[in-house]
Amino acid sequence: QLPPGKPEIFKCRSPNKETFTCWWRPGTDGGLPTNYSLTYHREGETLMHECPDYITGGPNSCHFGKQYTSMWRTYVMMVNATNQMGSSFSDELYVDVTYIVQPDPPLELTVEVKQPEDRKPYLWMKWSPPTLIDLKTGWFTLLYEIRLKPEKAAEWETHFAGQQTEFKILSLHPGQKYLVQVRCKPDHGYWSAWSPATFIQIPSDFIMNDHHHHHH
């Protein structure tokens, strides 16, 4: 029987900069029941606080609700593992909420086949940013990525759309039914999950274009 091994806080995420959750990995348990506590202070403070909510994020997590979350202050946190034989501490972790945002997927993905008379046909898609993300403040830049594939295909084709919320794709297989999805990430955050798939039937008379795709 031994003291617990060193835990590691390995992940912190915020859906919208207003709340966030951090997760830790326990070290070895030393063969004894082990208690974990997360303590933190914010930059400019010396007073240590204990995690306000060990429940919401699931096992080995600490959730910071709205009243505990500040975008303006860096959080300095540490996990303590204790059993009957002793204690061990994780390394200190520094968290700036700006850099841990993982948004919800984009919304309202619509996909249409456009067949202008004077030009080659193309697939046109548009979407909206997730509702929880406030883009009006200016500091939040969302980047988007699209993926699509014929229904029966194994491989996805991905396209980076930058900050645009619409996109054209010119090269598709006529007569195929395609699945299309979009996801987003802040410049220094994390990719959202993919949006639910939207299906689009490409007409049999769709003319393949030499140019693969272009941004709108």
């Epitope: 975008m71 968290v95 500091w139």
Partner: antibody, heavy 118, light 112 residues
Framework: EVQLVQSGAEVKKPGSSVKVSCKAS????????IHWVRQAPGQGLEWIGE????????NYNQKFKGRATLTVDKSSSTAYMELSSLRSEDTAVYYC???????????WGQGTLVTVSS | DVVMTQTPLSLSVTPGQPASISCRSS???????????LHWYLQKPGQSPQLLIY???NRFSGVPDRFSGSGSGTDFTLKISRVEAEDVGVYYC?????????FGGGTKVEIK
């Protein structure tokens, strides 16, 4: 203990490429961005770019875009910086550095001297 | 790119005496999220840089309290209240508000 261990010194000819490695240990490699910074002899520090090892997303200093390529190998917890079309002005010590969930550099590698000479 | 200008270029200090380094940026370092990402690093002779101060005034873990940072907007200062022999090296200010991140030219601190 967090460690960033870089590959050894390199001597390269002008016009060639160099690939510097940075092996991370003591933490979950995919959790934090890796940055690359260089320092020419007797000079200050210059930021080359950054990579998120979780998805290989990169941001580059425009000065190096097209010449520097940042990559990672998650299986070996190693980050790489490749610089092509080398010229004598690229002679420098190249550092990898790691952030937390922040945008400043908490841990640094020991540096790799790259000498470009004909 | 944001230009970071440090003064003085070098500083010779008697042990136990204070030292002050100034850093000025060519544009405001206040991020649109309200934070100011101005940091100070020390590069001791023959070593890699090490973080001293993050976000203007916050000492990094293990940094002695004789180091302090202050300033706002475009003007920032690093102060050492009582210089010790182990403080010799080159001090760099750095901003990470704007991409590309940039560094000052450095201030060399030596002991008299």
């Amino acid at each position: 203990e967090v460690q960033l261990v870089q590959s050894g010194a390199e001597v390269k000819k002008p016009g060639s490429s160099v690939k510097v490695s940075c092996k991370a240990s003591g933490y979950t490699f995919t959790s934090y961005w890796i940055h690359w910074v260089r320092q020419a002899p007797g000079q200050g520090l210059e930021w080359i770019g950054e990579i998120d090892p979780s998805d290989s997303y990169t941001n580059y200093n425009q000065k190096f875009k097209g010449r520097a390529t940042l990559t990672v190998d998650k299986s070996s917890s190693t980050a790489y910086m490749e610089l092509s079309s080398l010229r004598s002005e690229d002679t420098a010590v190249y550092y990898c550095a790691r952030s937390f969930f922040t945008n400043w550099f908490a841990y640094w590698g020991q540096g790799t001297l790259v000498t470009v000479s004909s | 790119d944001v230009v970071m200008t440090q003064t003085p270029l070098s500083l010779s200090v008697t042990p136990g005496q204070p030292a002050s380094i100034s850093c000025r940026s060519s544009q405001s370092l206040v991020h649109s999220n309200g934070n100011t990402y101005l940091h100070w690093y020390l590069q001791k002779p023959g070593q890699s840089p090490q973080l001293l101060i993050y976000k203007v005034s916050n000492r990094f873990s293990g940094v002695p309290d004789r180091f302090s940072g202050s300033g706002s907007g475009t003007d920032f200062t690093l102060k050492i209240s009582r210089v010790e022999a182990e403080d010799v090296g080159v001090y760099y200010c750095s901003q990470s508000t704007h991409v590309p991140f940039t560094f000052g030219g450095g201030t060399k601190v030596e002991i008299k």
